[in-house]
C-alpha cells in the first residue's frame, strides 16, 4: 500500500481466483484513543472499532472510503483504490490503447517546436467518476522540471455504438534548451481513477521525436507565364522556432483531386515556393517537415487550384549577416567552409537516417541504456551551438561538433560495427563513416589539433548486444547530426562573409 | 495489370512528320498522366513532355516546343506523339509511358523505333 | 535546366559484389531523384522513386539514398540479371532531364 495524496492509498493486488488479497491496517488520523468507530462509504454498518482498523483487501468491495468516528463526530477519512495486477501485468482498463506507432500506446505526445512545450493525450470510453492526475520530468534518476498543467476533456467522438473521450493535457518544461541535443528523455506519468481502481500509464519520449509541426501557412498562388505551371508559395507556420536558419524546414508539395486514387503532381523542397501543374477540380498541399530530423510531417495546408491569386506570399529563411568564424578555410580557397560543412552536414542527416530507419520506430530505452548513451558526447545547452552562442563565438561550438564526429567516427570503424552480425553488404554504414569523417577533416583548423573524447571501451561480447548498440549508437547520432547541420545552415546563412 | 502497347518502327526522309501511337489498357485512361521520352541509338534517355488524357493539357520540353504534338482519344484510349520537321538525329527509340505521378515514369511501352535517313 | 551527371560511365563488377553508382544534380533537387535500369532491347524499368522509396516487385537488393545535390544507388549482392544500364532522373523541375547513365558490366 501506498499513499498517492493525502488520504487516498493505493492498494496493490495481485488478481487471480482465491487470491489471498492484502492485509491493511489503516491508523485514525486523531489525539483520541477511546470510543472511535469505523464505517465504509455510506454504510453505517460499524466495521470494527479502536484507533486502527485491520482490514483484508482481496476485491473492489475492499475499496472505497473509510471513515473514523466518535459520538457521532467524523474524525478522518482514507480513501482505499485498487492497482490491479494480473500475470505480473498491471490492468489498463481505464485507457483505450491507441496501437499507433505500436501496441500498447496508451499515451501520444507532440511538440509543435522544439520550446520545451508538448501536448499529450488518451482515450477511454469512460465518461462519469473519472480523475486523471499528470506529473512529468527529464530523465528519471536526476529529475529536471516538467510542469504540467490538468488534464481536460479536449474531444468527445461517436465510434460505433460507443462514445470516445479524448484527454489531453499541456506541459512545459521549467529550462528548455532549444538547441540542444537531448540526451535525456521527457518522462510522463499519468494517474487514472476510475471510481476505486488505480492505473498509471506512463511514456518517455525526446521532444525531437514528438515533433510535428504545425502546417505550413499563408499559400498562394501565381501563374507561371507560358506554362502550365502556377508557383505556390506559402511561409513557415507561426508555432514553428526561430530564427528559421537554424531550425529549418523541409516541405512536400501535392497536387491531387477530391480522391487518394486520382493522378497526382508531387514534388519535395527546402525552399517556401514551389512549380507545380494544376488541374481543375484539383487542391495544392503542402505540408513540413524538420529538414533534419526525421519526426512526424504536419498535417496538410491545402488551397484550391482554382484559387490563383496574384499576390506572392511566403518567406525565405535567411537571417542578417553576423561576424566572421575561423572555421578552416577550403583547400584552394579563402572563404570559411560553412557552405560545404552544411551540405556535408545534410548529406550526414540523410545516411544517418538511412543507415537504420527502423531504428526510429524501435523503442531502444531499456535497462542500462543511459550508461551506454551516455558515454556518446551529446551537444549540450552550454557549448554555444545556440543561434547566440555561434554568433558570440563559434569557436566553442565547433569544437564540440568536431569533437562528436570523430567519437561517432571512431565508432563506426570499431568492432561493433565491424564484428558479427555482419552489417548488410547495402547499408550505408560505410558512406557514413567517410562522411563523419571528412566533416571533422573540414572543421579541423590548420596547426591546431583539439583534443578528442576517449572512446568508450564499449565491447558487447554477444552478436544481439552489438547490434542492439548499433541500434543505440545510430539513433544517437542521427540526433547529433541534426543540430550539427542546424549550426552548419545557420552558420552559412548568417556567418558567411 | 497496365500495359501500353505502341506503334510499328517508321522510316521517315528528313523534313518528314511521324506519328506514333500507343494504346493503354488495363486501367481507366484519364487515370494517368502520358509522357514521350526518347532514346537516340546508344545514348541516354530524353523527356519530351506529358499530357493529361483528362482534359488535353500539355507541357513540352523546350527542346521540342514548336515541333512536337502530343494527343489522346479517351474513346480508344491511345495517346499520339507528332513530330515535324524531321532530322536524322531524331533517330530514336520513342517510349510512351503512364503514371498517376507526374514526375517519373512508372509504365513503359515497348518502344517505337523512328528511322530519319535520306 | 537542370543537368545530371552519372559516374562511373562503366563499372565492372564481379556477380556477388556490391555496386554503387553515383548520380549528381547541378543544383539542390532535394528528395526529387528517381533511379531506373534498362537492359538491351528493352524499356527502362523505375527501380527507386523519390532517392530511397523501393518500388514493390523490385528486389530489396537495390537501395538509393541522398538528397540535395548528390545520391546514391547500390545494389548489394550482382546477381546475373544486374548487369544492364541504370539512369537517374530528376523531378525537381522541368523539363525533367536524365543522367547520361552507367554501365554495369561483368568483372
Known amino acids: 500500500i501506498w499513499e498517492l495524496k493525502k488520504d487516498v492509498y493505493v492498494v496493490e493486488l495481485d488478481w487471480y481466483p482465491d487470491a489471498p488479497g492484502e492485509m491493511v491496517v489503516l491508523t485514525c488520523d486523531t489525539p483520541e484513543e477511546d470510543g472511535i468507530t469505523w464505517t465504509l462509504d455510506q454504510s453505517s454498518e460499524v466495521l470494527g472499532s479502536g484507533k486502527t482498523l485491520t482490514i483484508q483487501v482481496k476485491e473492489f468491495g475492499d475499496a472505497g472510503q473509510y471513515t473514523c468516528h466518535k459520538g457521532g463526530e467524523v474524525l478522518s477519512h482514507s480513501l482505499l483504490l485498487l492497482h490491479k495486477k494480473e500475470d505480473g501485468i498491471w490492468s489498463t482498463d481505464i485507457l483505450k490503447d491507441q496501437k499507433e506507432p505500436k501496441n500498447k500506446t496508451f499515451l501520444r505526445c507532440e511538440a509543435k517546436n522544439y520550446s520545451g512545450r508538448f501536448t499529450c493525450w488518451w482515450l477511454t470510453t469512460i465518461s462519469t467518476d473519472l480523475t486523471f492526475s499528470v506529473k512529468s520530468s527529464r530523465g528519471s534518476s536526476d529529475p529536471q522540471g516538467v510542469t504540467c498543467g490538468a488534464a481536460t476533456l479536449s474531444a468527445e467522438r461517436v465510434r460505433g455504438d460507443n462514445k470516445e473521450y479524448e484527454y489531453s493535457v499541456e506541459c512545459q518544461e521549467d529550462s528548455a534548451c532549444p538547441a540542444a541535443e537531448e540526451s535525456l528523455p521527457i518522462e510522463v506519468m499519468v494517474d487514472a481513477v476510475h471510481k476505486l481502481k488505480y492505473e498509471n500509464y506512463t511514456s518517455s519520449f525526446f521532444i525531437r521525436d514528438i515533433i510535428k509541426p504545425d502546417p505550413p501557412k499563408n499559400l498562394q498562388l501565381k501563374p507561371l507565364k507560358n506554362s502550365r505551371q502556377v508557383e505556390v508559395s506559402w511561409e513557415y507556420p507561426d508555432t514553428w522556432s526561430t530564427p528559421h536558419s537554424y531550425f529549418s524546414l523541409t516541405f512536400c508539395v501535392q497536387v491531387q483531386g477530391k480522391s487518394k486514387r486520382e493522378k497526382k503532381d508531387r514534388v519535395f523542397t527546402d525552399k517556401t515556393s514551389a512549380a507545380v501543374i494544376c488541374r481543375k477540380n484539383a487542391s495544392i498541399s503542402v505540408r513540413a517537415q524538420d529538414r533534419y530530423y526525421s519526426s512526424s510531417w504536419s498535417e496538410w495546408a491545402s488551397v484550391p487550384c482554382s484559387g490563383s491569386g496574384s499576390s506572392r506570399g511566403g518567406s525565405g529563411s535567411g537571417g542578417s549577416g553576423g561576424g566572421g568564424s575561423k572555421l578552416r578555410a577550403v583547400p584552394g580557397g579563402s572563404s570559411p567552409a560553412w557552405t560545404q560543412c552544411q551540405q556535408l552536414s545534410q548529406k550526414l542527416c540523410t545516411l544517418a537516417w538511412s543507415a537504420h530507419p527502423l531504428v526510429g520506430h524501435m523503442d531502444l530505452r531499456e535497462e542500462g541504456d543511459e550508461e551506454t548513451t551516455n558515454d556518446v558526447p551529446h551537444i549540450q545547452c552550454g557549448d554555444g551551438c545556440d543561434p547566440q552562442g555561434l554568433r558570440d563565438n563559434s569557436q566553442f561550438c565547433l569544437q564540440r561538433i568536431h569533437q562528436g564526429l570523430i567519437f561517432y567516427e571512431k565508432l563506426l570503424g570499431s568492432d561493433i560495427f565491424t564484428g558479427e552480425p555482419s552489417l548488410l553488404p547495402d547499408s550505408p554504414v560505410g558512406q557514413l563513416h567517410a562522411s563523419l569523417l571528412g566533416l571533422s577533416q573540414l572543421l579541423q583548423p590548420e596547426g591546431h589539433h583539439w583534443e578528442t573524447q576517449q572512446i568508450p571501451s564499449l565491447s558487447p561480447s554477444q552478436p544481439w548486444q552489438r547490434l542492439l548498440l548499433r541500434f543505440k549508437i545510430l539513433r544517437s547520432l542521427q540526433a547529433f547530426v541534426a543540430v550539427a547541420a542546424r549550426v552548419f545552415a545557420h552558420g552559412a546563412a548568417t556567418l558567411s562573409p | 495489370q497496365v500495359q501500353l502497347v505502341q506503334s510499328g518502327a517508321e522510316v521517315k526522309k528528313p523534313g518528314a512528320s511521324v506519328k506514333v501511337s500507343c494504346k493503354a489498357s488495363?486501367?481507366?485512361?484519364?487515370?494517368?498522366?502520358l509522357h514521350w521520352v526518347r532514346q537516340a541509338p546508344g545514348q541516354g534517355l530524353e523527356w519530351m513532355g506529358w499530357?493529361?488524357?483528362?482534359?488535353?493539357?500539355?507541357e513540352y520540353a523546350p527542346k521540342f516546343q514548336g515541333r512536337v504534338t502530343m494527343t489522346t482519344d479517351t474513346s480508344t484510349s491511345t495517346a499520339y506523339m507528332e513530330l515535324r520537321s524531321l532530322r536524322s538525329d531524331d533517330t530514336a527509340v520513342y517510349y510512351c509511358?503512364?503514371?498517376?505521378?507526374?514526375?517519373?515514369?512508372?509504365?513503359w511501352g515497348q518502344g517505337t523505333m523512328v528511322t530519319v535517313s535520306s | 535546366e537542370i543537368v545530371m551527371t552519372q559516374s562511373p560511365a562503366t563499372l565492372s563488377v564481379s556477380p556477388g559484389e556490391r555496386a554503387t553508382l553515383s548520380c549528381r544534380a547541378s543544383?539542390?533537387?532535394?528528395?526529387?531523384l528517381h533511379w531506373y535500369q534498362q537492359k538491351p532491347g528493352q524499356a527502362p524499368r523505375l527501380l527507386i522513386y523519390?532517392?530511397?522509396q523501393s518500388i514493390s516487385g523490385i528486389p530489396a537488393r537495390f537501395s538509393g539514398s541522398g538528397s540535395g545535390t548528390e545520391f546514391t544507388l547500390t545494389i548489394s549482392s550482382l546477381q546475373s540479371e544486374d548487369f544492364a544500364v541504370y539512369y537517374c532522373?530528376?523531378?525537381?523541375?522541368?523539363?525533367?532531364?536524365f543522367g547520361g547513365g552507367t554501365k554495369v558490366e561483368i568483372k
Open positions: 523519390f532517392a530511397s
Open positions: 499530357i493529361d488524357p483528362e482534359n488535353g493539357d500539355t
Open positions: 509511358n503512364a503514371n498517376k505521378e507526374l514526375r517519373y515514369f512508372d509504365v
Open positions: 543544383q539542390s533537387i532535394s528528395i526529387n
Open positions: 488495363g486501367y481507366t485512361f484519364t487515370d494517368y498522366y
Open positions: 532522373q530528376q523531378s525537381n523541375s522541368f523539363p525533367l532531364t
